[in-house]
Interface confidence: low
């Protein structure tokens, strides 16, 4: 057989025995001559060098570049490949010689005592037990112990080859401590040497780097990276690191096995990379690879090296954040810095502490943003080493979708007297203010008599055919007033009013307000009745503990049996076709009330008096009257709202101020409460008296001091009082400059 590629000028060495395989008997002499075109050498089995005593290599007598190999009295162990080759080349000729020794059919290894085979428990791996044969066609089996098991070649995954040995799937013998090959020749058994079985693991479960990410250092600091490999038992691990700067003088690698708990099914290996003083060139990706021979796993981390400790805001740090009421707001402090800075958040100068509604950390999170969260938030980053500080202001604007104030107040069944002029109002609060408020209408019967439409409590008006109020044909004559802006409960609100010049037809009116973040609407049932009329005495919403009377007036010639009822607490049942005054047909939901009857020349008046009204008295009151002729019942409903008593509060602060002599001071003090509080002003705890220079306007809300003098300096107090108590705010006014002397002195 030939080995290597023939070069242009050299032929392969030529052997005297022109065969690939030669079979000879033991105790005979093996002699092969090799001829070539330059210096030759021989290699033979077992001892692959020229030191074997029994083997003789001699120069041929008949020519240059010729060598004869002679082995007298060959034995089975001389079985193997004999190679003749040109020195310093790959060009060779090979013959495989079997020395048939039936007393020793297996070639013994040089170490003779026993061999070692390394196996893994991998199902797909096979192992070769190197029991080579001196006879090519032996009947060989493999014995494993203990317990004793015999494996016979199956023509598939179990086989024996005289030149290679016994091949078997490794998991089949992984239980065994030792194995050997056995050959049967003429009912005689011959055994190879014993091979000790060593099970070697290969599985790497994971490779973990610590720290795993976000590693930052400044020049000169020490970098320590730990790489831990977790493996199955019987595994040996090689670690290999890749890093940016390979030429580092102060780089140190330490590999060691880590102890695991006894009985653990796992081994741990640790490789520690240390760089004593990092430089900028050490910045980059660090990769640790752990290899078990059959398996490699790796992990990487990025190491950032800064010139020196620093802190700065990232370019994406927002200056304006917009949100809608109820949303979760996240304002991340986007920074570049090493080491990570201490982060402190302030709102309008006041430090923010985390609680269940707000988390002030790397990200400022407001769980459910409300209007009061609007403002300027300052984030201050402090470098913990250099103490360098950076601050950034973020303005948070909280938008409010339109909210219509009266929506929760008005009963869906209010009634209006025929022929009267009525004003419908929508008071809208929205941020930003609504860019439009539109009014729509439709006839009550168009909406109410739509049996196919399902009616719900949230949408008692299933109708969709809304018409613009400009198109009032077939309805009431309407005029929409220009929107007004009013400060109500300390909030800027938009008030839209719609004037119905004569209440002739029952209709539904809808106002719709829209701003950039949403829309709000309110549907008003405008039920026109020719029946009784309800009025309130006094003609305003009562406050708790005040008295109020509800008057029901009906034409005596038309109506009789006037009765007052109150709607029960359960929601008004609404039936399709009966909207919006179903109360007369469903008296079960009403509570009958005691009332006093008065009469004048034309009307009966039924008066129901509430002394010391309470919040429980709020609700829908129904006056029922019966038509004298038809006996048909007519109902009118009036919703009564009782205002809660609220102690006085003053919105906004009085500011200390410094003014020069001769200038003017104007301050205002807005108070709220129910009943409305009285406002009084004091200077240095004495009641402030109006004179030519001191002017109080708008119910004492606004104080003006004209042409201030030195004696106007002092502590000014605004006090708002009602029966529920007082609230006050104070400010000190400093007057600068010298008082000019007047001629009068």
């Amino acid at each position: 057989a030939s080995v290597g590629l023939p070069s242009v000028s050299l032929d392969l060495p030529r052997l005297s025995i022109q065969k690939d395989i030669l079979t000879i008997k033991a105790n005979t002499t093996l002699q092969i001559t090799c001829r070539g075109q330059r210096d030759l050498d021989w290699l033979w089995p077992n001892n692959q060098s020229g030191s074997e005593q029994r083997v003789e290599v001699t120069e041929c007598s008949d020519g240059l570049f010729c060598k004869t190999l002679t082995i007298p009295k060959v034995i089975g162990n001389d079985t193997g490949a004999y190679k003749c080759f040109y020195r310093e080349t790959d060009l060779a000729s090979v013959i495989y010689v079997y020395v048939q020794d039936y007393r020793s059919p297996f070639i013994a290894s040089v170490s003779d005592q026993h061999g070692v085979v390394y196996i893994t428990e991998n199902k797909n791996k096979t192992v070769v037990i190197p029991c080579l044969g001196s006879i090519s066609n032996l009947n060989v089996s493999l014995c494993a112990r203990y317990p004793e098991k015999r494996f016979v070649p199956d023509g598939n995954r179990i086989s024996w080859d005289s030149k290679k040995g016994f091949t078997i799937p490794s998991y089949m013998i992984s239980y065994a401590g030792m194995v050997f090959c056995e050959a049967k020749i003429n009912d005689e058994s011959y055994q190879s040497i014993m091979y000790i079985v060593v099970v070697v693991g290969y599985r790497i479960y994971d490779v973990v780097l610590s720290p795993s990410h976000g590693i930052e250092l400044s020049v000169g600091e020490k970098l320590v990276l730990n790489c831990t490999a977790r493996t199955e038992l019987n595994v040996g691990i090689d670690f290999n690191w890749e890093y940016p700067s390979s030429k580092h003088q102060h780089k140190k690698l330490v590999n060691r096995d880590l102890k695991t708990q006894s009985g653990s099914e796992m081994k741990k290996f640790l490789s520690t990379l240390t760089i004593d003083g990092v430089t900028r060139s050490d910045q980059g990706l660090y990769t640790c690879a752990a290899s078990s021979g059959l398996m490699t796993k790796k992990n990487s981390t990025f190491v950032r090296v800064h010139e020196k400790p620093f802190v700065a805001f990232g370019s994406g740090m927002e200056s304006l954040v917009e949100a809608t009421v109820g949303e979760r707001v996240r304002i991340p402090a986007k920074y570049l810095g090493y080491p990570p800075p201490e982060i402190k958040w302030y709102k309008n100068g006041i430090p923010l502490e985390s609680n269940h509604t707000i988390k002030a950390g790397h990200v400022l999170t407001i769980m459910e943003v409300s209007e009061r969260d609007t403002g300027n938030y300052t984030v201050i980053l402090t470098n913990p080493i250099s103490k360098e500080k950076q601050s950034h202001v973020v303005s948070l604007v909280v938008y409010v979708p339109p909210q219509i104030g009266e929506k929760s107040l008005i009963s869906p069944v209010d009634s209006y007297q025929y022929g009267t002029t009525q004003t419908l109002t929508c008071t809208v609060y929205a941020i930003p203010p609504p860019h439009h408020i539109h009014w729509y209408w439709q006839l009550e019967e168009e909406c109410a008599n739509e049996p196919s439409q399902a009616v719900s409590v949230t949408n008692p008006y299933p109708c969709e055919e809304w018409r613009s109020v400009e198109d009032f044909q077939g309805g009431n004559k309407i005029e929409v007033n220009k929107n007004q802006f009013a400060l109500i409960e300390g909030k800027n609100k938009t008030v839209s009013t719609l004037v119905i010049q004569a209440a002739n037809v029952s209709a539904l009116y809808k106002c719709e307000a829209v701003n950039k973040v949403g829309r709000g609407e309110r549907v008003i049932s405008f039920h026109v009745t020719r029946g009784p009329e309800i009025t309130l005495q006094p003609d305003m919403q009562p406050t708790e503990q005040e008295s109020v009377s509800l008057w029901c007036t009906a034409d005596r010639s038309t109506f009789e049996n006037l009765t007052w009822y109150k709607l029960g607490p359960q929601p008004l049942p609404i039936h399709v076709g009966e909207l919006p005054t179903p109360v007369c047909k469903n008296l079960d939901t009403l509570w009958k009330l005691n009332a006093t009857m008065f009469s004048n020349s034309t009307n009966d008046i039924l008066i129901m008096e509430l002394k010391n009204a309470s919040l429980q008295d709020q609700g829908d009151y129904v006056c029922l009257a019966q038509d004298r002729k038809t006996k048909k019942r007519h109902c009118v409903v009036r919703q009564l709202t009782v205002l809660e008593r609220v102690a006085p509060t003053i919105t906004g602060n009085l500011e200390n101020q410094t003014t020069s002599i001769g200038e003017s001071i104007e301050v205002s003090c807005t108070a709220s409460g129910n009943p409305p509080p009285q406002i009084m002003w004091f200077k240095d705890n004495e009641t402030l008296v109006e004179d030519s220079g001191i002017v109080l306007k708008d119910g004492n809300r606004n104080l003006t001091i004209r042409r201030v003098r030195k004696e106007d300096e002092g502590l000014y107090t605004c006090q708002a009082c009602s029966v529920l108590g007082c609230a006050k705010v104070e400010a000190f006014f400093i007057i600068e400059g010298a008082q000019e002397k007047t001629n009068l002195e």
């Epitope: 990410h213 976000g214 980059g284 990706l285 990487s300 981390t301 990025f302 950032r304 990232g314 370019s315 994406g316 927002e318 200056s319 304006l320 954040v321 917009e322 949100a323 949303e327 707001v329 991340p332 986007k334 570049l336």
Partner: antibody
Framework: CQSLEESGGRLVTPGTPLTLTCTVS????????MGWVRQAPGKGLEWIGF?????STYYASWAKGRFTISKTSTTVDLKITSPTTEDTATYFC????????????????WGPGTLVTVSS | AVVLTQTASPVSGAVGGTVTIKCQAS??????LAWYQQKPGQRPKLLIY???KLASGVPSRFSGSRSGTEFTLTISDLECADAATYYC?????????????FGGGTEVVVK
């Protein structure tokens, strides 16, 4: 040294999904965001979206539903879910190596681009 | 989304001269604007970020400025190598949008 290289650009028929891959070198994707920008022949640059260091994705309003960005430890993929002829362009992946974290702002490292042609 | 409107192409300048390119934002984006240079068949190159900060390795002949929502890129001491298309890009993320927009581009011709 940080570098980006796009691959996967080829001629596709309309409606055939196509995935482009950006292979990064020297950049830790767990610390940096990566973005995609495209440029139709003879036209200007158009921002598609980016994937943050934590894996959150952000898309231009026109790109939502049309593209999907995902990543492994060393690659960032851009999937064009149902290409149309209007998606014919050179696609660049880009990164800001100076400004790592949740958002991708301006781009100071760009790949050479890969050409996608959508034609029936 | 922010819309960026750039100076119409082309803008011409002589070698050694100065050219300015404007970029108008449709809403407040503060200083969140970058400028890029792109030559035919090449990838874009960052010149300016944060409206006026010079990117590393960019000659000081390039400068950026901001006035409200109008941004300007100025190239002074013009060289032949400056012939390219210049793009502005906003990277302002508001609560309802993460649109990161490029302007339409302005071609600079050097005579």
């Amino acid at each position: 040294c940080q570098s980006l290289e796009e691959s996967g650009g080829r001629l596709v028929t309309p409606g055939t999904p196509l995935t482009l891959t950006c292979t990064v070198s020297g950049i830790d994707l767990s610390s940096y965001a990566m973005g995609w920008v495209r440029q139709a022949p003879g036209k200007g640059l158009e921002w598609i979206g980016f994937i943050s260091s934590s894996g959150s994705t952000y898309y231009a309003s026109w790109a939502k539903g049309r593209f999907t960005i995902s990543k492994t430890s060393t690659t960032v993929d851009l999937k064009i879910t149902s290409p149309t002829t209007e998606d014919t362009a050179t696609y660049f992946c880009a990164n800001n190596y100076d400004d790592y974290g949740d958002f991708l702002h301006y781009f100071n490292i760009w790949g050479p681009g890969t050409l996608v042609t959508v034609s029936s | 989304a922010v819309v960026l409107t750039q100076t119409a192409s082309p803008v011409s300048g002589a070698v050694g001269g100065t050219v300015t390119i404007k970029c108008q934002a449709s809403q407040h984006i503060y200083s969140n604007l970058a400028w890029y240079q792109q030559k035919p068949g090449q990838r874009p190159k960052l010149l300016i970020y944060a409206a006026s900060k010079l990117a590393s390795g960019v000659p000081s002949r390039f400068s950026g400025s901001r006035s409200g929502t109008e941004f300007t890129l100025t190239i002074s001491d013009l060289e032949c190598a400056d012939a390219a298309t210049y793009y502005c890009q906003s990277y302002y993320y508001s609560s309802d949008s993460t649109d990161n927009t490029f302007g339409g581009g302005t071609e600079v011709v050097v005579k």
